[in-house]
């Protein structure tokens, strides 16, 4: 019998057949098709695209393709009452107003329903007051302002530049500092790469370009009105005052032409150091307020957006497994965009479409995967990962029992320099082995493997000779699967050279200029990087769904657990006196990590030795691997973040996009020297060490011999 009883194609040929079927030309064609009009969540256009994808996935050969709808809280600008910011003089006259829309890109002048730039879920309001420039509005920026510079943001409107951290964290920080409004802007230092022209002549952000985006602090809750449960037809909805994560102050984004007009008049304190200066020809004074002649002028925000419960649609496609149909490998990416979605999300959606087509082709030839593959086109990701979270809430019992892995598929590119991978340590070996088998698309690496170019261009900071693989944070649809449910997850895309391009994300992110032409002209004319990303994402799904023994290596978790324990211990040891005073010991954690290492190694030995022809033993071993990620879930969640339940990883409390290791301990230690009750604070550190040590030990025991 072949090593894969799910197929009539020989095993070696399987993966090759699947990969060979993926075509750059198809991805290009799909991207074009998905980007001709806006597909904003909750709109008719996005519903029509959902139905189109449903129909095409059926044609491609999936066993079933269904729409899953939910009624969730979304946010839109008021069409007749636009949002803007003005400078007003002492008489209250508006002497400057920010633009109401982005100048449309060439060829798109007559497209209707382009949503103007706005900060989704901003409350309505017309605050006026003095401006304070708060740099990136990070935690450390407010520390600098309040503690070092003694500048009080209370009652002020703050202006912050986009970049470095998730915009929702900026707004939360501003709220906590007492601000009454937030203006977000894109500084050329972060969104204009030197030596590159602005769109349409290059991939840089023009002065009138603006980044849209939600400003929620959901902490994994999904729909703000139905946290923990699906927003279905019989849902009980919270009142808006009890909704999760909504900002309490008006927020609005602007481009750098408009920002120039606000920042050039700033007075008050000089910037504390060069890290607070962007690239505009302004002094970057912190304020508060305008300088000299302009000191009587104020800034006024005019925000009229509304929050509305709106229907959204996920597309869920199923390719039934031949041997283990009750084990699910999920490939999911979102479909909704802010405008055209040339990169985010359609460069990812086009890749998913081609992966589905390739799997469908194999299925039509008589092949089936060993395990079931679920394909998802999520809605309302841009509004807080709502489609994926609601679906996972609705199906949580199935997912926690049957979910093998989740592979995310948002934007395939954010640059064209090298591969970028974030995943669970369980997938490290899978990613390494797969990329060693794929050809690099990079210039200068002809005939070399993707692993080789990736390692050369993005070396691991800890382990020389290996590529960097990052921790999963959030800000994308894997969040509910990994952080809440404990399903092994990963993501891959092509990225920029972080060494030479310090700007945040890619310059045209969430702007009207994120078009098909942006990708086709400037990022990937041959679609070779898209194809490589399709091979990585598709190859991972193929292996996860098809390999007899799940391609998870628990020994790699042992390696990182030790690294993370070392790191958090070092952070704690910055307070040696308090460690002594309050008898803080990490012995239990280091002991648990050592036990995990030992048990994982023994498990790996058994994994090599067991009789793979015995389906019961095979299933037992695979279940131990599948449930290992689940074992890191604490049912009680992290403090004040009940939907972040993974004890080893969580989104950083200071930047949703970034992953933090041992987040419970990390947060307990953060800024501990400023806590009013040190005894209580160090007590919480001890409690978090206890929780972490117990969880690691408990996870280790799931790998022990069952009897």
């Amino acid at each position: 019998k072949s090593s894969n009883e799910a197929t009539n194609i020989t095993p070696k040929h399987n993966m090759k057949a699947f990969l060979d079927e993926l075509k750059a030309e198809n991805i290009k064609k799909f991207l074009y098709n998905f980007t001709q009009i806006p597909h904003l969540a909750g709109t008719e256009q996005n519903f029509q695209l959902a139905k189109q994808i449903q129909s095409q996935w059926k044609e491609f050969g999936l066993d079933s393709v269904e729409l899953a709808h939910y009624d969730v809280l979304l946010s839109y600008p008021n069409k007749t009452h636009p949002n803007y910011i003005s400078i007003i003089n002492e008489d209250g006259n508006e002497i400057f107003n920010t633009s109401l829309f982005e100048p449309p890109p060439p060829g798109y002048e007559n497209v209707s329903d382009i949503v103007p730039p706005f900060s989704a879920f901003s409350p309505q309001g017309m605050p006026e007051g003095d401006l304070v420039y708060v740099n990136y509005a990070r935690t450390e920026d407010f520390f600098k302002l309040e503690r070092d510079m003694k500048i009080n943001c209370s009652g002020k409107i703050v202006i912050a530049r986009y970049g470095k951290v998730f915009r929702g964290n900026k707004v939360k920080n501003a709220q906590l500092a007492g601000a009454k409004g937030v203006i977000l802007y894109s500084d050329p230092a972060d969104y204009f790469a030197p030596g590159v022209k602005s769109y349409p002549d290059g991939w840089n952000l023009p002065g009138g370009g603006v980044q849209r985006g939600n400003i929620l602090n959901l902490n994994g809750a999904g729909d703000p009105l139905t946290p923990g449960y699906p927003a279905n037809e019989y849902a009980y909805r919270r009142g808006i005052a009890e909704a999760v994560g909504l900002p309490s102050i008006p927020v609005h984004p602007i481009g750098y032409y408009d920002a120039q007009k606000l920042l050039e008049k700033m007075g008050g304190s000089a910037p504390p150091d060069s890290s607070w200066r962007g690239s505009l020809k302004v002094p970057y004074n912190v304020g508060p307020g305008f300088t000299g002649n302009f000191s009587t002028q104020k800034v006024k925000m005019h925000i009229h957006s509304t929050n509305e419960v709106t229907r959204i649609y996920n597309v869920i496609g199923t390719l039934r497994g031949a041997v283990e149909p009750d084990r699910y490998v999920i490939l999911g990416g979102h479909r909704d965009s802010w405008v055209f979605g040339g990169i985010d999300p359609q460069s990812g959606a086009a890749v998913v479409h081609e992966i589905v087509r390739s799997f469908g082709t194999l299925k039509k030839e008589g092949w089936r995967p060993r395990r079931t593959i679920l394909f998802a086109s999520w809605d309302a990701e841009e509004f807080g990962l709502l489609g994926s979270t609601e679906w996972a809430e609705e199906n949580s019992r199935l997912l926690q029992e049957r979910g093998v892995a989740y592979i995310n598929a948002d934007s395939s590119i954010e640059g064209n320099y090298t591969l970028r991978v974030d995943c669970t340590p369980l997938m490290y070996s899978l990613v390494h082995n797969l990329t060693k088998e794929l050809k690099s698309p990079d210039e200068g690496f002809e005939g070399k493997s993707l692993y080789e170019s990736w390692t050369k261009k993005s070396p691991s900071p800890e382990f020389s000779g290996m590529p960097r693989i990052s921790k999963l944070g959030s800000g994308n649809d894997f969040e509910v699967f990994f952080q809440r449910l404990g399903i092994a997850s990963g993501r891959a895309r092509y990225t920029k050279n972080w060494e030479t391009n310090k700007f945040s994300g890619y310059p045209l992110y969430h702007s009207v200029y994120e078009t098909y032409e942006l990708v086709e002209k400037f990022y990937d004319p041959m679609f070779k990087y898209h194809l490589t990303v399709a091979q990585v994402r598709g190859g991972m799904v193929f292996e996860l769904a098809n390999s007899i023994v799940l391609p998870f290596d628990c020994r790699d978790y042992a390696v990182v657990l030790r690294k993370y324990a070392d790191k958090i211990y070092s952070i704690s040891m910055k307070h040696p006196q308090e460690m002594k005073t309050y008898s803080v010991s990490f012995d239990s954690l280091f002991s648990a990590v050592k036990n995990f290492t030992e048990i994982a190694s023994k498990f790996s030995e058994r994994l090599q030795d067991f009789d793979k022809s015995n389906p019961i033993v095979l299933r037992m071993m695979n279940d131990q691997l599948m449930f290992l990620e689940r074992a890191f879930i604490d049912p009680l969640g992290l403090p004040d973040r009940p939907f972040y339940r993974h004890v080893i990883y969580a989104p950083s409390s200071h930047n949703k996009y970034a992953g933090e290791s041992f987040p419970g301990i990390y947060d307990a230690l953060f800024d501990i020297e400023s806590k009013v009750d040190p005894s209580k604070a160090w007590g919480e550190v001890k409690r978090q060490i206890y929780v972490a040590a117990f969880t690691v030990q408990a996870a280790a025991e799931t790998l022990s011999e069952v009897a």
Epitope: S464, M466, K594, I599, E605
Partner: antibody, heavy 121, light 110 residues
Framework: EVQLVESGGGLVQPGGSLRLSCTAS????????MSWVRQAPGKGLEWVSA????????YYADTVKGRFTISRDNSKNTLYLQMNSLRAEDTAVYYC??????????????WGQGILVTVSS | QSVLTQPPSVSAAPGQKVTISCSGS????????VSWYQQLPGTAPKLLIF???KRPSGIPDRFSGSKSGTSATLGITGLQTGDEADYYC???????????FGTGTKVTVL
């Protein structure tokens, strides 16, 4: 019974290269971190490098970082140490050692007999 | 330059007891497991103690290990001539992400 056998040592000129091998038997090689430890003539033990079980994360002592590369071939049960830009102070007996716990280095429960590397002009 | 410090030598008569100290810091001995190795003249090192105080099978109970804070101690009772050797402590260092050995102690049986 665990056996670790080093090979590939010898005399090399300063600036030259050498590749040491360690062939393992008697245990499931891929599950354990493996290390290289050296001992200069008349001196104490110095840990040089380790490689984890699983995906093979490498660790190095500062004295060899950037010059030495540790690797493993699990299919051949063999550990390697590629030594480049050798210096006189790299002269030592090099031991291959198996970890006693698992995928990361904790303690060395089995050692090879050692192989002499001499760097001299 | 070793980060773990041991006395260069200790000596005692047969049947007596010797102790060897190993002094480190919070980043190595303080939060990691200590092991001890015996190296008889002209041979490879041999594991004597692991996890601070455990003996591998075949190691007599005359050998004992302990750890307190950032120091560890190896004890040898009922000293025998066959115990003449160099002894090394070793542990992981969390800050260096590296394994570290002690400077080594020569035990002489008088």
């Amino acid at each position: 019974e665990v056996q670790l056998v080093e090979s590939g040592g010898g005399l090399v000129q300063p600036g030259g290269s050498l590749r040491l091998s360690c062939t393992a038997s008697g245990f499931i090689f891929s599950s354990y971190a493996m290390s290289w430890v050296r001992q200069a003539p008349g001196k104490g033990l110095e840990w040089v490098s380790a490689i984890s079980g699983g995906y093979g994360a490498p660790y190095y002592a500062d004295t060899v970082k950037g010059r030495f590369t540790i690797s493993r071939d699990n299919s051949k049960n063999t550990l390697y140490l590629q030594m480049n830009s050798l210096r006189a102070e790299d002269t030592a007996v090099y031991y291959c050692a198996k970890d006693g716990v698992g995928a990361t280095p904790y303690y060395f429960d089995d050692w090879g007999q050692g192989i002499l590397v001499t760097v001299s002009s | 330059q070793s980060v773990l410090t041991q006395p260069p030598s200790v000596s005692a008569a047969p049947g007596q007891k010797v102790t060897i100290s190993c002094s480190g810091s919070s980043s190595n001995i303080g939060n990691n497991y200590v092991s001890w190795y015996q190296q008889l003249p002209g041979t490879a090192p041999k594991l004597l103690i692991f996890d601070n105080n455990k003996r591998p099978s075949g190691i007599p109970d005359r050998f004992s290990g302990s750890k307190s804070g950032t120091s560890a101690t190896l004890g040898i009772t009922g000293l025998q001539t066959g115990d003449e050797a160099d002894y090394y402590c070793g542990t992981w260092d969390s800050s260096l992400s590296a394994y570290v050995f002690g400077t080594g102690t020569k035990v002489t049986v008088l």
